[in-house]
């Protein structure tokens, strides 16, 4: 027999890792292998998630918590709880239905996932392009053209040269 030291509804006494077994006089049966219950008072145990194929196990299942998956190298997680794995691409590429494709001119992607995004339009902020964009990197915006009037320099002047063998004072 099973003793529970409680006068409440017997099912509310069933802790995490067990379920209230209606087939057996509502005793708190332990979750069978490969199943879990993360809260008390449950009428069933949930089947453990299996991390197969492109998924790999990040955290093993236990009687009280589900397994957690991530993706094998070359793939990354998408969706809540890593519900999907999507193929990585190189920086400068995006994933299309036909596979990884280089970013079009004027766009970039600095990650192995996601889509190519347009370069920043420096002129919208009244600035000029300091460093050109590439497939992998966004443009770097510099001071506005007005800031580059004669006598003004956008480049920091070099530090004065020191004679060899002398330490700074």
């Amino acid at each position: 027999f099973e003793r529970t030291r409680s006068l409440q509804d017997p099912c509310s006494n069933c802790p995490a890792g067990t379920f209230c077994d209606n087939n057996r006089n509502q005793i708190c049966s332990p979750c069978p292998p490969n199943s879990f219950s993360s809260a008390g008072g449950q009428r069933t145990c949930d089947i453990c998630r299996q991390c197969k194929g492109v998924f790999r196990t990040r955290k093993e299942c236990s009687s009280t918590s589900n397994a957690e998956c991530d993706c094998t190298p070359g793939f990354h997680c998408l969706g809540a709880g890593c519900s999907m794995c999507e193929q990585d691409c190189k920086q400068g590429q995006e994933l299309t239905k036909k596979g990884c494709k280089d970013c079009c001119f004027g766009t970039f992607n600095d990650q192995k996932r996601g889509i190519c995004r347009p370069w920043t339009n420096c002129s919208l902020d009244g600035k000029s392009v300091l460093v050109n964009g590439t497939k992998e990197r966004d443009v770097v915006c510099g001071p506005s053209p007005a800031d580059l009037s004669p006598g003004a320099s956008s480049v920091t002047p070099p530090a004065p040269a020191r004679e060899p063998g002398h330490s700074p004072q």
């Epitope: 099973e2 529970t4 049966s29 069978p32 009280t64």
Partner: antibody, heavy 122, light 108 residues
């Protein structure tokens, strides 16, 4: 080292009481690991006494034959489980084993103590 | 739940194939474990969930069955396999964790 160590066995008169202890080391009892007691009379087979939920709840699972004479309890702070045996009879003479019933092993007993001898005799 | 094992004893030689059966008084799905016990020692888990080999157990041991009827097979008996074998229901609650009656395997 992962192990279970029983203690508290000895000789007791019929009608007497005894409390056995089982100390776990190298792991903690939890919802994945239930402590259990099993006994074996001289020259006989294994006999399941009962188990207790490994977490903080006091749910116990007992063999019908214990009829309330045997009670399993647990002290999580000491990672120790106890078997209180009352109204002992000659037929309770046996080696008493503490075992770990593990969710990871289909609730099979994947770890056992060395056993402690209990003799009920006048 | 009552667990009945057969035979209660058997004699065999090294290299023999040995089969031990276990019957539950009611369905226990695949919730069955098998143990090996040598004199003066604690039992050792061999198989759980009816057919899954426990860690470190040689592959000559195998288990099968579901519901009420289960089998432990030793494909080629080795000298260290002479021992007593027990089945156990791991179907918790209502006296659910009973052991079988045991099968003693001795040298022919």
């Amino acid at each position: 080292e992962v192990q279970l160590v029983e203690s508290g066995g000895g000789r007791v008169q019929p009608g007497g009481s005894l409390r056995l202890s089982c100390a776990a080391s190298g792991f903690s009892f939890s919802a994945n690991y239930y402590p259990c007691w099993v006994r074996q009379a001289p020259g006989k087979g294994l006999e399941w006494i009962g188990c207790i939920y490994g977490g903080s709840s006091d749910i116990t699972y007992d063999a019908n034959w214990t009829k309330g004479r045997f009670t399993i309890s647990r002290d999580n702070s000491k990672n120790t489980v106890y078997l209180q045996m009352n109204s002992l009879r000659a037929e309770d003479t046996a080696t008493y084993y503490c075992a770990r019933s593990a969710w990871y092993s289909g609730w099979g007993g994947d770890l056992w103590g060395q056993g402690t001898q209990v003799t009920v005799s006048s | 739940i009552q667990m009945t094992q057969s035979p209660s004893s058997l004699s065999a030689s090294v290299g023999d194939r040995v089969t031990i059966t276990c019957q539950a008084s009611q369905s226990i799905s695949n919730r069955l474990a098998w143990y090996q016990q040598k004199p003066g020692k604690a039992p050792k888990l061999l198989i759980y969930s009816a057919s899954t080999l426990a860690s470190g157990v040689p592959s000559r041991f195998s288990g099968s069955g579901s519901g009420t009827d289960f089998t432990l097979t030793i494909s080629s008996l080795q000298p260290e396999d002479f021992a007593t074998y027990y089945c156990q229901s791991t179907y918790y609650g209502n006296d659910g964790n009973a052991f079988g009656t045991g099968t003693k395997v001795t040298v022919l």
